[in-house]
Interface confidence: low
């Protein structure tokens, strides 16, 4: 069975459990030739697009979305989608961002490293959004 555009992956640096006020960067990855990466929240209720795409490897491109100061409102599920002209890819798996109060205790780790959601072999749903709505008040480089 031929594949369509490969599914993107999403990861978070330094992790998915982020102390209040700290920063987090979502990393979306897809094939080479991607024109636009989109980071979506909660079933496309809000999203951010970037054309600042870099080549991560000979066969992979990536975009980074940074939130400088995480608030409780940033918690929730995130996923990536990309546009490789003239088509949109499927969505990545969801990645859940958790925001925790800073207790300052030495035993409480700041982050949960190595968290990512990669492509699956046969996704059950291909969502295709040819005419996506305009970015809903989000700044070009930051979600909030």
């Amino acid at each position: 069975q031929e594949e369509d555009l490969p599914r993107p992956s999403i990861s978070a640096e330094p992790g998915t459990v982020i102390p209040l006020g700290s920063h987090v960067t979502f990393v979306c990855r897809g094939p080479v030739g991607v024109q636009t990466f989109r980071l979506e929240r909660e079933s496309r209720s809000t999203y951010n697009d970037t054309e600042d795409v870099s080549q991560a490897s000979p066969s992979e491109s990536e975009a980074r979305f940074r939130i400088d100061s995480v608030s409780e409102g940033n918690a929730g599920p995130y996923r990536c989608i990309y546009y490789k002209p003239p088509k949109w890819s499927e969505q990545s798996d969801y990645l859940e961002l958790l925001v925790k109060e800073t207790s300052g205790g030495p035993d409480s780790p700041d982050t949960e490293p190595g968290s990512s959601a990669g492509p699956t072999q046969r996704p059950s749903d291909n969502s295709h959004n040819e005419h996506a709505p305009a970015s809903q008040g989000l700044k070009a480089e930051h979600l909030y």
């Epitope: 069975q1 031929e2 594949e3 369509d4 030739g33 002209p85 291909n126 295709h128 040819e130």
Partner: antibody, heavy 122, light 107 residues
Framework: EVQLQQSGPEVLKPGASVKISCKAS?????????MNWVKQSHGKSLEWIGY????????SYNQKFKGKATLTVDKSSSTAYMELRSLTSEDSAVYYC??????????????WGQGTSVTVSS | DVQMIQSPSSLSASLGDIVTMTCQAS??????LNWFQQKPGKAPKLLIY???NLEDGVPSRFSGSRYGTDFTLTISSLEDEDMATYFC?????????FGGGTKLEIK
């Protein structure tokens, strides 16, 4: 074997509408494929009308054919349709459906229907 | 829209000749170019995709190349069955656009 079987020739009067069908077989209609429609006027080149994504019905049209062509699918019968409305002599042409396959990171119109001739004459 | 300027519009060649035809894109840096062969009364048949990739089952005498926005289809040794019209298609930018065609005749 992948096959796209189109409906037969049509002779219509100006102002009429017509719905052309394209029945797909030999592959999973709703898997990762788009269906394109292409117009070829007599002795002329090819014009892309638009595509439809059978999985969810999403469409994209050439601006030139917006309001003229409407693309739909019936997933249960693996059939794509193109309706042309308000026909004029300019719409007389052969219309093809063509599947968008995906090979080695490239989209390709790899399989084509045999074409449906539409003649508009008073 | 991206215009695809195809030349020549017709050409005549002898069996065994090397034949070339070109398509020039009006814009676009990373175009996925397809070449098709069409015989009278038949649907187009895919020959080349991605500018230079040969479709399965297509004879190896057909090849495609790209230099910037110029794309070339070459038939290395013309055979009788190659008499047809050839079209290019840019399959990257919406709307997709075809070249005007090159009608190839055998001398």
């Amino acid at each position: 074997e992948v096959q796209l079987q189109q409906s037969g020739p049509e002779v219509l009067k100006p102002g009429a509408s017509v719905k052309i069908s394209c029945k797909a077989s030999g592959y999973t209609f709703t898997d990762y494929y788009y269906m394109n429609w292409v117009k070829q006027s007599h002795g002329k080149s090819l014009e892309w009308i638009g595509y439809i994504y059978p999985n969810n019905g999403a469409t994209s049209y050439n601006q030139k054919f917006k309001g003229k062509a409407t693309l739909t699918v019936d997933k249960s019968s693996s059939t794509a349709y193109m309706e042309l409305r308000s026909l004029t002599s300019e719409d007389s042409a052969v219309y093809y459906c063509a599947r968008d396959g995906y090979s080695s990171n490239y989209y390709t119109m790899d399989y084509w229907g045999q074409g449906t001739s539409v003649t508009v004459s008073s | 829209d991206v215009q695809m300027i195809q030349s020549p519009s017709s050409l005549s060649a002898s069996l065994g000749d090397i034949v070339t035809m070109t398509c020039q894109a009006s814009q676009g840096t990373s175009i996925n170019l397809n070449w098709f062969q069409q015989k009278p009364g038949k649907a187009p048949k895919l020959l080349i995709y991605g500018a230079s990739n040969l479709e399965d089952g297509v004879p190896s005498r057909f090849s495609g190349s790209r230099y910037g926005t110029d794309f070339t289809l070459t038939i290395s040794s013309l055979e009788d069955e190659d008499m047809a019209t050839y079209f290019c298609l840019q399959h990257t930018y919406l709307p997709y656009t075809f070249g005007g065609g090159t009608k190839l005749e055998i001398k």
